[in-house]
């Protein structure tokens, strides 16, 4: 009954694990909140208890570790399911406390069902290979911790629903699916499924991934701008309406922010007093290089507008660039009554 | 998704002229520039110029320079070719087509292209 | 202007076989660090399709049995191994600075 720090439902952590399968998932309190691990903890006389909250439910209970076959048990920081089922879904939290001190987190565990191709409404992980770039490899994630060293299981990669097997540049190493030269064709699901004994029963992990092949970075230059250029020039009237696109092109690259913005006079847009309005969209190539287009829009343009520099810039971790746009003043076309008439000698 | 639909076909007499249209979807349209290309029956490939949508901005082939205008409207996305003082020997396939973005500054390639408009020309 | 003459006019193979088709351009039309060549496929009676561009870079959906490779003035179209549906004429293009580009006088494959 005393204050525990409740640290709330982590949603952050969104755990997922497919129904039948083990299942190790560690109290996040030693992950993301505290600044101490599970030993200290322990050695300092804490104790950490779990309990949970069914689906749909709001009654918090304890969890049933007397199942049998020993089904959901816990080992210092790490409750087990050997193995889930679909009604384990809920809210879980775990507890550390003693008499003075308490400190609890909860967060949502979701049973999900797979079907024989591996499909289901688990999320993700992507791994990026680059294109053409020689011998890369994906490793079977989360499959640490579940077996002891000495086991040695068996492991089977498919391709979306079939058996990786006799494919020509994608080959199985046991946890490593190496790509000999990776394509964009080898985008796509991939699985692993790791079948070990524990106790004279066999337990099967799957861990589904998806490859997306990207730029290579022996590929990659500094950005690219198409537009404006010295081939297209903005001749204007006053009071017509002003549009000049810049559109850059960037060479994809892992962890890069690319940036473009517009200067006009050597100022950023919104430091000056024209009535200007930016709009942006961004488009991606199949290997996520990335097309960014910034449209500057002067509704009615003065004369005045039309003697300032506009200047398009573009950053990525591969450099810096700039472009001005040719903008200018159309020359009206000479109106017969005043201008011609003169010319002629009229008065 | 880009789509590039052209008018129908067309029939013109020698000395007349023609005017064709493209209108564009499924993409920033001010941002890419627009060719024009034809084929004459059983031919290959001939470019005749290009337009930017954003500032009008056209280069023409020497060949068609004087005879061919490219215009664009804005606010319907739509590209127009107009070919002037028309002879037998243009009837031909129009085809209007986009130019691409890459990694490169220059050198660009044709990635949409309309579905073609024949003209014929004949007295 | 650049003139690109493509060879040979028409080529017949086996379904399965290798198909080439050459390109030469009459002055080189690359630059550092890329070649402005492009391939276009063209089905009886339907708009080119881009192929290749720059060279070597497969568009988007097109089967990797279509490489292109070259620089400068040569340039090459392969499509191994050949099947039905690649039965059309093949034009090789190049846009070397704004505003002149120009095509090749085509190839026309036929399936043997």
């Known amino acids: 009954s005393e204050r525990c720090d409740d640290w709330g439902l982590d949603t952050m952590r969104q755990i997922q694990v497919f129904e039948d399968e083990p299942a190790r998932i560690k109290c996040p309190l030693f992950e993301h909140f505290l600044k101490f691990n599970y030993s200290t903890a322990h050695s300092a006389g804490l104790t950490l208890i779990w309990y949970w909250t069914r689906q749909d439910r709001d009654l918090e209970e304890p969890i049933n570790f007397r199942l049998p076959e020993n089904r959901i048990s816990k080992e210092k920081d790490v409750l087990w399911f050997r193995p889930t089922l679909l009604n384990d879904t809920g809210n879980y939290t775990c507890m550390l406390r003693n008499t003075t001190y308490c400190s609890k987190v909860a967060f949502p565990l979701e049973v999900v069902q797979k079907d024989s191709c591996f499909n289901s409404p688990m999320k993700l992980p992507v791994h990026k290979l680059y294109i053409e770039y020689g011998i890369q490899r994906i490793t079977c994630p989360n499959v640490d911790g579940y077996f002891p060293s000495s086991v040695k299981p068996t492991i089977t990669w498919y391709m979306g629903c079939y058996k990786i097997q006799n494919f020509n540049n994608v080959i199985p190493e046991g946890m490593n699916l190496s790509f000999l030269i990776a394509l964009i064709s080898n985008n796509g699901n991939y699985t692993c499924v790791v079948t070990y004994p524990e106790n004279g029963r066999t337990f099967h992990l799957t861990r589904t991934l998806t490859v997306k092949v990207v730029g290579s970075p022996k590929n990659a230059v500094p950005p690219v701008i198409h537009s404006p250029n010295d081939h297209v020039v903005y001749e204007k009237e006053p009071g017509e309406e002003l549009l000049i696109p810049c559109t850059v092109y960037f060479s994809f690259l892992m962890d890069s922010r690319n940036e473009v913005w517009w200067t006009i006079d050597g100022k950023k847009p919104d430091d000056i007093t024209i009535d200007v309005t930016i709009n942006e969209s961004i488009s991606h190539s199949r290997t996520e290089d990335e097309t960014r287009t910034q449209i500057l829009s002067i509704k009615k343009v003065t004369s005045e507008d039309l003697k300032r520099s506009y200047v398009c810039h573009a950053r990525s971790a591969k450099g810096e660039v700039a472009k001005a746009a040719k903008v200018k003043q159309k020359v009206p076309a000479p109106r017969y009554t005043v201008e011609l008439a003169c010319g002629f000698g009229a008065t | 998704q880009v789509q590039l639909v052209q008018s129908g076909a067309e029939v013109k007499k020698p000395g007349a002229s023609v005017k064709v249209s493209c209108k564009a979807s499924?993409?920033?349209?001010?941002?890419?520039?627009m060719n024009w290309v034809r084929q004459a029956p059983g031919q290959g490939l001939e470019w005749m110029g290009q337009?930017?949508?954003?500032?009008?901005?056209?280069y023409y082939a020497q060949k068609f320079q004087g005879r061919v205008t490219m215009t664009r409207d804005t606010s319907t996305s739509t590209v127009y070719m107009e070919l002037s003082s028309l002879r037998s020997e243009d009837t031909a396939v129009y085809y209007c087509?986009?130019?691409?973005?890459?990694?490169?500054?220059?050198?660009?390639?044709?990635?949409?292209w309309g579905q073609g408009t024949l003209v014929t020309v004949s007295s | 202007d650049i003139v690109l003459t493509q060879s040979p006019i028409s080529l017949a193979v086996f379904l399965g076989q290798r198909a080439t088709i050459s390109c030469r351009a009459s002055?080189?039309?690359?630059?550092?660090?890329?070649?402005?060549m492009h391939w276009y496929q063209q089905k009886a009676g339907q708009p080119p399709k881009l192929l290749i561009k720059?060279?070597?870079d497969l568009e988007s959906g097109v089967p990797v049995r279509f490489s292109g490779s070259g620089s400068g003035t040569d340039f090459i179209l392969n499509i191994h191994p050949v099947e039905v549906e690649d039965i059309a004429t093949y034009y090789c293009?190049?846009?070397?600075?704004?505003?002149?580009?120009?095509f090749g006088g085509g190839t026309k494959l036929e399936i043997k």
């Open positions: 720059y060279a070597s």
């Open positions: 087509a986009r130019t691409d973005f890459y990694r490169y500054d220059g050198g660009y390639a044709l990635d949409y």
């Open positions: 002055q080189s039309v690359s630059t550092s660090g890329y070649s402005s």
């Open positions: 337009i930017f949508p954003a500032s009008g901005t056209t």
């Open positions: 499924g993409y920033i349209f001010i941002t890419y520039w």
């Open positions: 293009h190049h846009s070397w600075g704004i505003p002149m580009y120009t």
